[in-house]
Amino acid sequence: QRLSRAQQQLPLESLGWDIAELQLNHTGPQQDPRLYWQGGPALGRSFLRGPELDKGQLRIRRDGIYMVHIQVTLAICSSTSTSRHHHPTTLAVGICSPASRSISLLRLSFHQGCTIASQRLTPLARGDTLCTNLTGTLLPSRNTDETFFGVQWVRP
Amino acid sequence: QRLSRAQQQLPLESLGWDIAELQLNHTGPQQDPRLYWQGGPALGRSFLRGPELDKGQLRIRRDGIYMVHIQVTLAICSSTSTSRHHHPTTLAVGICSPASRSISLLRLSFHQGCTIASQRLTPLARGDTLCTNLTGTLLPSRNTDETFFGVQWVRP
Amino acid sequence: QRLSRAQQQLPLESLGWDIAELQLNHTGPQQDPRLYWQGGPALGRSFLRGPELDKGQLRIRRDGIYMVHIQVTLAICSSTSTSRHHHPTTLAVGICSPASRSISLLRLSFHQGCTIASQRLTPLARGDTLCTNLTGTLLPSRNTDETFFGVQWVRP
């Protein structure tokens, strides 16, 4: 898609560059596998510049292709604690609303590890809300260098 | 932050785009957990375009939000070699100077694996020096496809 | 490298922004360790905007520094299935043609895990074809949230 002359003359900011890096606030109540995120300079090195938080979930405000990345570290963890469960603890990042666009974007299991980390490019639309679901009973670390979730707009 | 008319008229290079991809040079002496990096076309596919190296540590020369990424593979490694240690080998990336800005940005343990890889968005300032600390006695691979560390300026 | 006045005045599209996110199509026949990829909106959330596919391998059409990322999940996998093999299953991403530029860019072993994920910055040139080689007998998952491969042009 070509950029209009007006877009070329506006600051590059106006082209997009929406970006966010979030830290873990807390896990959900029982039966709610979602992780709840928070961000802002008062909290440390997390920030929201464009996207916004809606009850701890990340909402996109600009259409485009985004790089989505996540790292989650389990808080009290050893190779045995992750492997002794019948079902491995799994982390899934997906669009959870609007329901019509619901889809899993990124899925990782811990198996015998205590940290998962990955990233991917994906198209996102204004209003898409991203949820990060952690299945199982193991608790994620709230340390900001161990558990974080972010998106970066990379092109229209 | 709005970009000035002058900034808009300069080549996009001048907006930032600082970028570096480094390969492992060597580990530190005993009691120094830092990894020492090197970069430049003469060495292969590593490069520094903006950031610089100071005694093997990466120094930032432009304020902004950066994508920091790292992969470290242990050289002589099996699932048993990483799991039989009382403490898992751990890799931490952080700002180590200036001391007033010292903080851990990214932390991963190997547990029963032989490679860690992750990435995150973080604000960095001119003069920040990034250190990568590898705790434990296991040695990292110097293969350029197995161990590397990089940063990419993504926005002001 | 400075951008010409013409480049500055063209839409930002023309500066680069080549990008692709691919999903797994199939593995190769015996003796061919390559993974074969596919992309396009008809397939889901995968896409090619600049790079192109040549018999399931990704070919670069614009010189520059790229962020290359990959995640591969083994389909029928447990910690024991990856560890009981004498040689760990390994994934390597490299330039496979032209032969004169053949090199391994990124290498990861599964050890006792069932997913690998990583990313790196690397210079690529027009005509470089990237191959992703999976050694071993284990089969990768074709789920689009578990196995994907992408590149993003980040600067000249």
Partner: antibody, heavy 120, light 107 residues
Framework: QVQLQESGPGLVKPSQTLSLTCTVS??????????WSWIRQHPGKGLEWIGY???????DYNPSLKSRVTISVDTSKNQFSLKLSSVTAADTAVYYC????????????WGQGTLVTVSS | DIQMTQSPSSLSASVGDRVTISCRAS??????FNWYQQQPGKAPKVLIY???SLQSGVPSRFSGSGSGTEFTLTISSLQPEDFARYYC?????????FGQGTKVEIK
């Protein structure tokens, strides 16, 4: 078996500095997997976290004591230390050193505690 | 700081009794919550971590539950060695804080 052992004077005069050392055995502070904390317990009262140190020397202190507390580490001796300045009778307590995980603040190993009395 | 308020401050019970101790956090802390037992003259030891996980070696008569701000430690059948002081602690954010303690005495 991880063991922590506090040592230092049991009696300190008001306005002086309380100094204690914790020696760790069965574990290496430099391994980097844990925070090393000081916790105190006033006679017949609850537990109060004073602060922690990481092998790298980074610290975090309880704001209520921050202006008077310094925690340091000597990885070569596998020890960490507490200094509390300008003490008063209100600092009389049993002082414990303890280990907690980096990823989760669970105090899984403690010293046996040492009673420090502030009195002239 | 997050305040942790325990109740009761003391209770009397007999061997075989079912005992519950409560702890309230001044803000939501999720499952970042632990229980300790302290015998007279000894250091505390972990009973329950992450709200409801039993520490290795701790008898199964101890259990924990919670709702993010309200937490309960239950001893299903009190044993002679359970007469001690119990503390709650939050692991949500520094400064790490403890409850004031609950003393379980013999009736």
């Amino acid at each position: 078996q991880v063991q922590l052992q506090e040592s230092g004077p049991g009696l300190v005069k008001p306005s002086q500095t309380l100094s204690l050392t914790c020696t760790v055995s069965g574990d290496s502070i430099i391994s980097g997997g844990y925070y090393w904390s000081w916790i105190r317990q006033h006679p017949g009262k609850g537990l109060e976290w004073i602060g922690y140190i990481f092998y790298s020397g980074s610290t975090d202190y309880n704001p209520s004591l921050k202006s008077r507390v310094t925690i340091s580490v000597d990885t070569s001796k596998n020890q960490f230390s507490l200094k509390l300045s300008s003490v008063t009778a209100a600092d009389t307590a049993v002082y414990y050193c303890a280990r907690s995980g980096y990823s989760y603040a669970l105090f899984d190993h403690w010293g046996q505690g040492t009673l420090v009395t502030v009195s002239s | 700081d997050i305040q942790m308020t325990q109740s009761p401050s003391s209770l009397s019970a007999s061997v075989g009794d079912r005992v519950t101790i409560s702890c309230r956090a001044s803000q939501f802390i999720g499952r970042y919550f632990n229980w300790y037992q302290q015998q007279p003259g000894k250091a505390p030891k972990v009973l329950i971590y992450a709200e409801s996980s039993l520490q290795s070696g701790v008898p199964s008569r101890f259990s924990g539950s919670g709702s993010g701000t309200e937490f309960t430690l239950t001893i299903s059948s009190l044993q002679p060695e359970d007469f001690a002081r119990y503390y709650c602690q939050q692991s949500y954010s520094t400064p790490w804080t403890f409850g004031q303690g609950t003393k379980v005495e013999i009736k």
